[in-house]
Amino acid sequence: MSITGISPITEYLASLSTYNDQSITFALEDESYEIYVEDLKKDEKKDKVLLSYYESQHPSNESGDGVDGKMLMVTLSPTKDFWLHANNKEHSVELHKSEKPLPDQAFFVLHNMHSNSVSFESKTDPGVFIGVKDNHLALIKVDSSENLSTENILFKLSETHHHHHH
């Protein structure tokens, strides 16, 4: 599975919340960022994440109209130079400072259920998704027999009217 271009095809600034409307927030603690899943107080400002969309060519036998075997990969950056990374060994989701080109651990295959409801599958560990576990983000294995609509891996993107992310 290879990214077909070094530049994102589009970028989207949004706030991220769980299916149950808890907000994903990011806090700088001891020079590293922590990720929290929490209820925000009324009128409390939501953290924003820059989603960068990349096209990826899936290795397949498909051919013909040039449009098959493509998938959308996203990277998620809540603040300058920091991206969400999949730590597949620890089954955790972490924020790391990275330089471009970003490592594969920073890329997630986008699955969307429309109405701005999405799931993020680890590029480095197919079948493993960003999910919510004990009020934290974690990597959760989803059996192929399960429906991807399982709520703990579903997230809502809500648009923001601010154009600057940093």
């Epitope: 589009t10 989207y12 051919s63 109209d65 075997g69 493509k70 986008l110 969307n112 429309h114 109405s115």
Partner: antibody, heavy 121, light 106 residues
Framework: EVQLVETGGGLVQPGRSLKLSCVAS????????MYWIRQAPGMGLEWVSS????????YYLDSVKGRFTISRNNAENTVYLQMNSLRSEDTATYYC??????????????WGQGTLVTVSS | DIQMTQSPSVLSASVGDRVTLSCKAS??????LDWYQQKVGEAPKLLIY???NLQTGIPSRFSGSGSGTDYTLTISSLQPEDVATYFC????????FGQGTKVEIK
């Protein structure tokens, strides 16, 4: 080569039913969202219904909700549109389309040639 | 629901002209916008996706731009084979087409 072939259109009386089929080939059907879009004679395009790759999520235009049902059989590479309680305003060419990316509901990358549904007494 | 409004409804231009088609959304659609071309008697064809990405096999004279609520399809040098109706389409929230712009040769 990607192909989408729609069948099942025809002349039907108001209030009756019709089932459209779209047989897909040339791509991994089960990885893609599929859609039905219609076009009344001489008019613009109107999205009608969507189904995600595993069939677990379906969406409908408000005016067809409760009357139309989209479904898919991934083993047979086929997507269906069951149309009940048909009205004259449902008269249109119905196109089947496939999504652009695996697992994502963005863009209609490829369209079939369409099947004409005429609702008239 | 998001409404999409295209202008003009009909555009008449000469071969070689630079042609600009407009599409306006009732809400911010975050660049989640496509352009489709439909020739008489044919199925529509995807030209541009995510506002400015050219679909495989589409000539480079077609380009897209825009953000927020305002989007544009440009044909840098109109060719006889570009005679068609062009539809914009948003997929940011639900799925909605514009009413179309018919492009004719003078």
């Amino acid at each position: 080569e990607v192909q989408l072939v729609e069948t099942g259109g025809g002349l039907v009386q108001p209030g009756r039913s019709l089932k459209l089929s779209c047989v897909a080939s040339g791509f991994t059907f089960s990885n893609y969202w599929m859609y039905w879009i219609r076009q009344a004679p001489g008019m613009g395009l109107e999205w009608v219904s969507s189904i995600n790759n595993d069939g677990g999520n379906t969406y409908y235009l408000d005016s067809v909700k409760g009357r139309f049902t989209i479904s898919r059989n991934n083993a047979e590479n086929t997507v269906y549109l069951q149309m009940n309680s048909l009205r004259s305003e449902d008269t249109a060419t119905y196109y089947c389309a496939k999504g652009h990316y695996y697992y994502s509901s963005y863009s209609f990358a490829f369209w079939g040639q369409g099947t004409l549904v005429t609702v008239s007494s | 629901d998001i409404q999409m409004t295209q202008s003009p409804s009909v555009l008449s231009a000469s071969v070689g002209d630079r042609v600009t088609l407009s599409c306006k959304a009732s809400h911010n659609i975050n660049k989640h916008l496509d352009w489709y071309q439909q020739k008489v008697g044919e199925a529509p064809k995807l030209l541009i996706y995510f506002t400015n990405n050219l679909q495989t096999g589409i000539p480079s004279r077609f380009s897209g731009s825009g953000s927020g609520t305002d989007y544009t399809l440009t044909i840098s040098s109109l060719q006889p084979e570009d005679v068609a109706t062009y539809f914009c389409f948003q997929y940011n929230s639900g799925w909605t087409f514009g009413q179309g712009t018919k492009v004719e040769i003078k």
